[in-house]
């Protein structure tokens, strides 16, 4: 199962739920579905308040229990380490796959943290991060921001991923904007 890591803004906008949490147990495999669940301790929620309603405490994250079907395998044994988890809600349960955005909170740049906590949401409605995978590539709409990190280096380590968000400049126009300048 292979997938290109998305721009963190894309991960935020396309997810039903974005939280910060610690993985606190070994995975349990469901004997019927062959899905596994990890026990987590949620410390912050950045997206999903309305979707969750009253059930605002997520205690488990679900994923296929096999690599071949895009299951997520958590490799860190540090139970105090916090992770940013962006996933989908299915029947009120948080689901992730290999392709989901799951990253140690400490590995995120200050700009990315700012994005998840405040800024990415501003661009969700109107703006689209448009991956440029090979040259030439051109904007298909004024609301698209060309994401060129993959052309230069690993997509999640690129400058646009770590420091920029695609945000509305004016109606019908989105541009890359620095998240650094918005950090208090």
């Amino acid at each position: 199962c292979t997938c290109v890591p998305p721009h963190p803004q894309t991960a935020f906008c396309n997810s039903d739920l974005v939280i910060r949490a610690k993985f606190v147990g070994t995975p349990e495999v469901n004997q019927t579905t062959l899905y596994q669940r990890y026990e987590i301790k949620m410390t912050k929620m950045y997206k999903g308040f309305q979707a969750l309603g009253d059930a605002a405490d997520i205690r488990f994250v679900y994923t296929p229990a096999m690599e071949s079907v895009c299951g997520y395998f958590h490799r860190s044994h540090n139970r105090s380490e916090e992770f940013l988890i962006a996933g989908k809600l299915q029947d009120g349960l948080l689901h992730i796959t290999t392709c989901s955005f799951v990253a140690p909170w400490n590995s995120l740049s200050l700009a990315q943290r700012r994005g998840f906590t405040k800024t990415y949401t501003v661009g969700c409605e109107e703006c689209t991060v448009f991956p440029c995978l090979s040259i030439p590539c051109k904007l298909q709409s004024g609301t698209h921001c060309l994401w060129t990190d993959q052309l230069l280096q690993g997509s999640e380590k690129g400058f646009q991923s770590r420091h920029l968000a695609c945000l509305p400049r004016e109606p019908g126009l989105c541009t890359w904007q620095s998240l650094r300048s918005q950090i208090a």
């Epitope: 070994t26 004997q31 019927t32 096999m66 079907v69």
Partner: antibody, heavy 113, light 111 residues
Framework: QVQLVESGGGLVQPGGSLRLSCAAS????????MSWVRQAPGKGLEWVSA????????YYADSVKGRFTISRDNSKNTLYLQMNSLRAEDTAVYYC??????WGQGTLVTVSS | DIALTQPASVSGSPGQSITISCTGT?????????VSWYQQHPGKAPKLMIY???NRPSGVSNRFSGSKSGNTASLTISGLQAEDEADYYC??????????FGGGTKLTVLG
Amino acid sequence: QVQLVESGGGLVQPGGSLRLSCAASGFTFSSYAMSWVRQAPGKGLEWVSAISGSGGSTYYADSVKGRFTISRDNSKNTLYLQMNSLRAEDTAVYYCARFLDIWGQGTLVTVSS
Amino acid sequence: DIALTQPASVSGSPGQSITISCTGTSSDVGGYNYVSWYQQHPGKAPKLMIYDVSNRPSGVSNRFSGSKSGNTASLTISGLQAEDEADYYCQSYDFKTYLVFGGGTKLTVLG
């Protein structure tokens, strides 16, 4: 008591086909993922294939992918393994197993000309 | 392919204790609490002795015990008896391939 009984083994020529069955009793069959495991004569155990409780998800070892098909009929409490394009190296006792615990007694499959 | 490493053979005298190790990786033994141990006598089907690392099915003697540390699981048989002579296989859930097995350990009871 929980029981798994395999059947359908026998002698088949290389390139031939065989369908194994496993009749389950003593537990709620549809609540368990099931698998097939085999053991070649004098050798160790090798996982072959697995299927989720609903039958919606199937998994195969690389050595049998594209040749074997696992399926189940929850109304009959029966697990199946359709084996096509059989090779000499598929010769083994085939065991049916419930998730991670209960096994049947096995059925011998011999592939030989 | 044998994914879990077991010693090919171990031996002990009646009344002694022996331990069989089973070493895997973080995606199988180390990643899950789903290690099982099977006893197989010649010409017979494998019999479940331990499941979920350290649980014994009903009917299995309490002389059999299981444990795990990191990527290595262990089966200990205390008060060894002649009927314990058999092949022992470890099995683990595996994120990469669903189920993996050890190559088997032949237990010989001396005397």
